[in-house]
């Protein structure tokens, strides 16, 4: 018979014949022959192959490097890679999440508009007139200036975007 030019799904062409691919979780040891089947071996510990394949080496599981703010979300198997995610207080640098960075803090004069998540950083906003923030924080919003009037006091020192107003007693009218 004519040697095949194409093979069925889960097969590959080698030496003018169709051999079975190795199943996920296994690597190729030797190609099939006229008389023998494809020989495959399971991937070792901390290795995987996630497709029907003819790879002679399995892939190493991804290392979730704590120095890059990563931790294991899902342990890999012989058929799947390890999935990493960010440590608490860190967020991914891209959609693929190959590394993480610490959430940014909002500087004094800025408040948190949106608290960071595992995939997005802190969003800061400048404190508008009437509000202040005197700390560097990843959680604190801008606080409103103290209302001296409601305490029956007067403003002794005006507030800024970084400082609260200073209240003091009203001057007594002398007789």
């Amino acid at each position: 018979p004519e040697p095949p030019t194409a093979c069925r799904e889960k097969q590959y062409l080698i030496n003018s014949q169709c051999c079975s691919l190795c199943q996920p979780g296994q690597k190729l040891v030797s190609d099939c022959t006229e008389f023998t089947e494809t020989e495959c071996l399971p991937c070792g510990e901390s290795e995987f192959l996630d497709t029907w394949n003819r790879e002679t080496h399995c892939h190493q599981h991804k290392y979730c490097d704590p120095n890059l703010g990563l931790r294991v979300q899902q342990k890999g198997t012989s058929e799947t890679d390890t999935i990493c995610t960010c440590e608490e207080g860190w967020h991914c640098t891209s959609e693929a999440c190959e590394s993480c960075v610490l959430h940014r803090s909002c500087s004094p004069g800025f408040g948190v508009k949106q608290i960071a998540t595992g995939v997005s950083d802190t969003i800061c906003e400048p404190c508008p007139v009437g509000f202040f923030s005197n700390v560097s924080s990843a959680f604190e919003k801008c606080h409103p200036w103290t209302s001296c009037e409601t305490k029956d006091l007067v403003v002794q020192q005006a507030g800024t975007n970084k400082t609260d107003v200073v209240c003091g007693p009203q001057d007594r009218l002398r007789a």
Epitope: H59, E98, V101, D121
Partner: antibody, heavy 113, light 108 residues
């Protein structure tokens, strides 16, 4: 990771370089391209993440295209409208938007009329 | 556009001495900074990740510090083999992935 051969190009030519990877899956790790003009510093061109998203330096957005073939285990950089200023050693490195711990040896691209 | 500025270059010191290289970001990148060493004819080698963490197999003579916009790489007990060009790299986001201009370290 290893880059394909560079070579001599003329101004206005299009450069195509291929990075071939082994020992890891492109579904697990991204690949980036970095270049270095003779006697100059490192310049990030762009990269492709493990999810297939491509990212580019602002200067390269209009001229560079990075694609991948997960089955062939290759990542391709195409750069159009070459000028003499594109003469450099081009490196591919494992990783998208991250730290690059594994680099290819680099390949020299010369643009000259 | 986002920039990383490295200073000074070149910097020289005697064997056994200490050198300090600075890297300044044009906007906050938290701790998303790495340091690399590159010798002529070779690709770069990563030394520090996350601004202050030693990469695997790197000598503890290398020390990274800083966060936000100001970062420092210090090399103590200098050896002849430390003569190289050092680069900082931001990886905070795709729009701020960039290398510094490099600092040449000369060991006398």
């Amino acid at each position: 990771v290893k880059e394909s051969e560079g070579g001599l190009f003329k101004p206005t030519d299009t450069l195509t370089l291929t990075c071939t990877v082994s020992g890891f899956s492109l579904s697990s790790y991204g690949v980036s391209w970095v270049r270095q003009a003779p006697g100059n510093g490192l310049e990030w061109i762009g990269g492709i993440g493990s999810d297939g998203s491509a990212y580019y330096a602002s200067w390269a957005k209009s001229r560079a295209t990075i694609t991948r073939d997960t089955n062939l285990k290759t990542v391709t950089l195409e750069m159009t409208s070459l000028t003499v200023a594109d003469t450099a050693t081009y490196f591919c490195a494992r990783g998208g938007i991250t730290v690059y711990a594994i680099w290819g040896p680099g390949t020299l691209v010369t643009v000259s009329s | 556009a986002f920039e990383l500025t490295q200073t000074p270059s070149p910097v020289s010191a005697a064997v056994g001495g200490t050198v300090t290289i600075k890297c300044q970001a044009s906007q906050s990148i938290s701790n998303g900074l790495a340091w690399y060493q590159q010798k002529p004819g070779q690709p770069p080698k990563v030394l520090i990740v996350g601004a202050s963490n030693l990469a695997s197999g790197v000598s503890s003579r290398f020390k990274g510090s800083g966060s936000g916009t100001e970062f420092t790489l210090s090399i103590s007990d200098l050896e002849c083999a430390d003569g190289a060009t050092y680069y900082c790299q931001s990886y905070f986001s795709s729009s701020s992935t960039v290398f510094g201009g490099g600092t040449e370290v000369v060991v006398k």
